[in-house]
């Protein structure tokens, strides 16, 4: 005889009792009323199961909570099912069996019916696991039930001091959705908060789980698919203060069925968003947007932020949102890169875009900007990267497109192409009043607007000029003079420079900043405007360094161990990290610090010039890095501000040296022998290049490298021209914020 193999199947759910009412006492597990009612309700549940063919499999059950409606019982039960029947007893089948029993008139074994009038319609049965029950049981010492009335913002009481795990069981009116707001009040903690689209902590109904005080999302709002949610907290380390604040609201279902007609222009025309954006989208989200385009000359571009779409096999669920665009199924996924989906127009009736959440696990709300593009010329003067839908500079020596096609088939790479014979001349020789091309095409159209391209400078009126790097060179090249605006920058305070020396003199690098915590130099930076210092995002990598309040910025400083009259200090009012910064890859390694009060410029304190996106820093050019970093690998920081000249390195040469880990947002500089390099403590400091006008432009920020000054391993810097749009955006947006 062989014993039958059984498996324990766990079910979780709720049922509504019509002849009972919820009372506050029933909401407290420690009350006598709760103990008495839960014992009776459990007996009722056991009898209900026993009245069906499931009775033979019954193992155990528990009614662990009560809620409104008139009285809702929340329970779990375990059935020991023969292995061969496991798949046939799905939650749907179990629910059907129990509903049939509730609707039947048979009086056998139905003593539970005399005391409890159970609403068959309201029976909910979900699949659970033994682990879910373990998690649930671990929270029972700190189990909080709350009913959320419409219109109220209900603050939830924080965890009890002595507990290690708590569960907030949230319920609202049937026709509304639960929305939870979680705000981290500290920067470092090891707590875990998980939110579930169910009354209990069912792994299969997890909406999101956050570990540690999330710096990326200090405040998050999360939607359930309906009127129930469970929030579970697990303690990380002992702390007297709660590391978070929780509040909850019941909100109406928001429709996202939209019909839009676009105008015949190429700028951004609006956005599509998931309901309650920027809240996490709900597990029940289904949006349908119909966009009508004015003519077939245009295509539709959807501009995503830190989210992208890709093809996925039909048998695979989309875990971060499913998109249907013109009958093409695409899956969304979060990414630290920009992305555009381009939809070519083939029919005049426009395009329908559907967004659906296929699983309970969701993510931050999705916002998509939309615009039209010219189907015959989608990227004027640039290259359309089919991998990510973006327009990128072509033939500039930097592979912006992941497949590198923007640098293929180039007649001239990072050079000017003569019209006469397709020879290439160096960019500084264009519009320099000296013909270099055979028929002088490099000196034509220098006084008029030209089509915009990779190396043309875009004036404020959006026209472009042919002369490379025309900013602040003392000559007005734009019709509107915008190339000579904002030019109070890039001039050294003192003319005597110690050429070839290592120690800097006062006023030599007046934009140099020292970023300090409690009097200790941590990183370098550069002054770029009267309230703004730029530095590297990785300086704020550690949780203990993430708060702006900790930092002091020194400008005009020369020596770390002493102060002198030329230096000034500032507190930091706000810190902006590039949203795409990725610690592991060092990509987008840039941050902006807003100072608590404006800087008064002097001979020793003044900003460096910011390059335009089109500014070209030529490989082979000699530039300078400055900082108080270590003078040898592993050494202490320097007392006196050091300077060193380095040479800009062709991107592919550096990429080879670093096994292709160098992104388009990175720039390499150094010394093939090694020796001359940035080091620990220089991070975030400026790499500056002098233009023929005598002004210094910010080419890079000290970011990373293998060791310091090692042969064949150059220093890697954040390429400022590739993050300048973000810099300008932050500066413009937060100009008046004090």
């Amino acid at each position: 005889y062989k014993a039958e193999v059984t498996v324990s199947q766990v079910y979780s759910g709720s049922l509504r009792v019509l002849n009972r009412h919820f009372s506050q006492d029933l909401g407290r597990r420690e009350s006598i009323a709760f103990r008495s009612e839960s014992a009776k309700a459990q007996k009722m549940l056991q009898e209900l199961v026993a009245s069906t063919r499931l009775g033979t499999y019954y193992n155990s059950s528990s009614v662990y909570s009560f809620g409104e409606g008139p009285l809702t019982c929340f329970f779990w039960f375990i059935l020991d099912i023969p292995e061969y029947q496991r798949l046939t007893l799905s939650p749907e089948v179990v629910r059907e069996l129990l509903v049939d029993e509730l609707l039947s008139n048979s009086s056998t074994l139905a003593s539970y019916k005399t005391e409890y009038e159970v609403d068959p319609e309201g029976l909910v049965i979900l699949e659970a696991s033994v682990n879910d029950i373990v998690v649930l049981n671990s929270t029972l010492g700190c189990y909080r039930y709350s009913y959320v009335n419409p219109g109220q913002v209900l603050p939830l009481k924080g965890p009890d001091q002595q507990t290690t795990s708590c569960l907030w069981h949230l319920q609202g009116p049937e026709d509304l959705m639960i929305k939870v707001r979680l705000e981290w009040t500290r920067v470092d903690c090891r707590d875990r908060v998980a939110m579930y689209d169910a009354a209990g902590p069912l792994e299969k109904r997890l909406i999101t789980s956050v570990y540690g005080c999330s710096r990326q999302e200090p405040v998050m709002e999360v939607l359930a698919s309906g009127s129930v949610m469970a929030v579970v907290w697990k303690k990380g380390m002992h702390s007297y203060y709660d590391p978070f604040l929780l509040s909850v609201k019941s909100v109406a279902f928001q429709d996202c069925q939209v019909n839009l007609t676009l105008e015949g222009r190429l700028d951004t025309q609006g956005f599509l968003r998931t309901p309650y954006y920027p809240s996490y989208y709900s597990p029940s989200t289904h949006c349908s947007w119909h966009l009508t385009v004015p003519s077939l000359d245009y295509g539709l571009a959807l501009w995503f932020d830190a989210y992208a779409l890709r093809r996925q096999k039909y048998n695979r669920l989309c875990t971060q949102g499913q998109w249907m665009i013109q009958n093409r199924r695409l899956c969304g996924f979060r990414t630290l890169q920009p992305y555009a989906e381009r939809i070519p127009m083939v029919a005049s009736d426009g395009v329908t875009i559907n967004f659906t959440s296929q699983i309970s696990l969701t993510g931050p709300g999705v916002q998509v900007y939309y615009s039209l593009y010219n189907q015959s010329d989608p990227c004027p003067g640039e290259f359309l990267c089919s991998v990510n839908g973006l327009c990128v500079p072509a033939c500039d020596g930097i592979k912006d497109c992941p497949n590198g096609l923007d640098e293929r088939n180039c007649v001239c790479r990072a050079m000017f192409q003569c019209q006469e014979d397709s020879t290439c001349i160096s960019l500084p020789r264009v519009c320099d009043r000296q013909p270099d091309c055979l028929n002088g095409s490099d000196e034509e159209q220098c006084q008029e607007g030209v089509p915009c391209g990779t190396f043309t400078f875009q004036c404020e009126d959006r026209s472009c000029v042919k002369k490379p790097n025309p900013e602040c060179d003392g000559q007005s090249d734009c019709r509107d003079g915008s190339d000579e605006q904002h030019c109070d920058c890039g001039l050294q305070g003192l003319s005597s420079r110690i050429v070839g020396g290592t120690v800097s003199s006062e006023g030599e690098w007046p934009w140099q900043a020292s970023l300090q915590i409690r009097g200790r130099h941590i990183c370098g930076g550069a002054l770029i405007a009267d309230r703004w210092v730029i530095t590297a995002a990785h300086c704020f990598q550690e949780d203990s360094m993430a708060s702006p309040k900790l930092w002091t910025v020194f400008l005009g400083k020369m020596r770390q161990n002493s102060r002198w009259p030329g230096e000034v200090s500032f507190k930091v009012s706000r810190l902006f990290l590039h949203p795409y910064h990725e610690e592991d890859s060092h990509d987008y390694d840039v941050a902006l610090l807003q100072l608590d009060h404006p800087v008064v410029y002097s001979a020793t304190v003044r900003p460096v010039c910011l390059p335009a996106r089109s500014h070209f820093f030529e490989p082979g050019q000699h530039c300078w890095i400055t900082g108080w970093g270590a003078q040898r690998e592993g050494g202490p920081v320097s007392n006196t501000l050091q300077k060193v000249d380095v040479q800009l390195v062709p991107q592919d040469l550096c990429s080879e040296a670093y096994r292709y880990q160098v992104s388009p947002r990175m720039l390499c500089a150094g010394y093939r022998k090694g020796k001359k390099d940035a080091c620990q403590g220089d991070s975030g400091g400026p790499l500056v290049c002098r233009e023929p006008s005598g002004r210094w432009f910010l080419a890079g920020l000290v970011s990373w490298g293998l060791g310091c000054g090692r042969p064949n391993f150059f220093g890697v810097y954040t390429r400022v021209t590739r993050v300048i749009n973000w810099i300008q955006q932050v500066l413009t947006h937060h100009h008046h914020h004090h």
Epitope: D652, L653, Y671
Partner: antibody, heavy 118, light 107 residues
Framework: EVQLQQSGAELVKPGASVKLSCTAS????????IHWVKERTEQGLEWIGR????????TYAPQFQGKATIIPDTSSNTAYMQLSSLTSEDAAVYYC???????????WGQGTSVTVSS | DIVMTQSHKFMSTSVGDRVSITCKAS??????VAWYQQKPGQSPKILIY???TRHTGVPDRFTGSISGTTYILTISSVQAEDLALYYC?????????FGGGTKLEIK
């Protein structure tokens, strides 16, 4: 003024070795790479290899591996190149030159003529 | 190894003429190409590096340019003292390689 002064012409027997010197003035060889280049009539210029005198790290062209050995003497600001097992193929003018950063060779010595004859 | 090919061993020109000497690289060396001038009995002298950058003291009649993977040294108005042997060299990766040289002669 930057100068690279090379040793005088050499007449050597087949199978023998020769050591050529290159003394720098006007700069410190430790801050630069020192290269050696071979020139044969009708054959043009051939890069032999280079040394970083600061740490002695060398790089050679494959065809000169085992043939040439470059060594520095930082105390005398001099770089040497030894050529071994000489044959008539090694008869040429040898130049030393310096380079910095990623740049090519900007200053060259006057050259040393090596004749291989029995 | 990267092969640098100077297809013309000799080029004839007259004083005052514009002349272009070419050099083709077997693979992409970005702009890491130098040009040297060598006169009889002398060592090579650098004229151009990074394909287009003139070395200090080099007359501005010498310019460097590129066409695809072909690197060009142009002398806008040939002077008598420019008659010499011209070499290109890639300084992109070791082993550094030279072109075979082009001898500029007077017609």
């Amino acid at each position: 003024e930057v100068q690279l002064q090379q040793s005088g012409a050499e007449l050597v027997k087949p199978g023998a070795s020769v050591k050529l010197s290159c003394t720098a003035s006007g700069f410190n060889i430790e801050d630069y790479y020192i290269h050696w280049v071979k020139e044969r009539t009708e054959q043009g210029l051939e890069w032999i290899g280079r040394i970083d005198p600061e740490d002695g790290e060398t790089t050679y062209a494959p065809q000169f591996q085992g043939k040439a050995t470059i060594i520095p003497d930082t105390s005398s600001n001099t770089a040497y190149m030894q050529l071994s097992s000489l044959t008539s193929e090694d008869a040429a003018v040898y130049y030393c030159a310096r380079s910095i950063y990623l740049d090519p060779m900007d200053y060259w010595g006057q050259g040393t003529s090596v004749t291989v004859s029995s | 190894d990267i092969v640098m090919t100077q297809s013309h061993k000799f080029m004839s020109t007259s004083v005052g003429d514009r002349v272009s000497i070419t050099c083709k690289a077997s693979q992409d060396v970005t702009t890491a190409v130098a040009w040297y001038q060598q006169k009889p009995g002398q060592s090579p002298k650098i004229l151009i590096y990074w394909a287009t950058t003139r070395h200090t003291g080099v007359p501005d009649r010498f310019t460097g340019s590129i066409s695809g993977t072909t690197y060009i040294l142009t002398i806008s108005s040939v002077q008598a003292e420019d008659l010499a042997l011209y070499y290109c060299q890639q300084h992109y990766s070791t082993p550094y390689t030279f072109g075979g040289g082009t001898k500029l002669e007077i017609k």
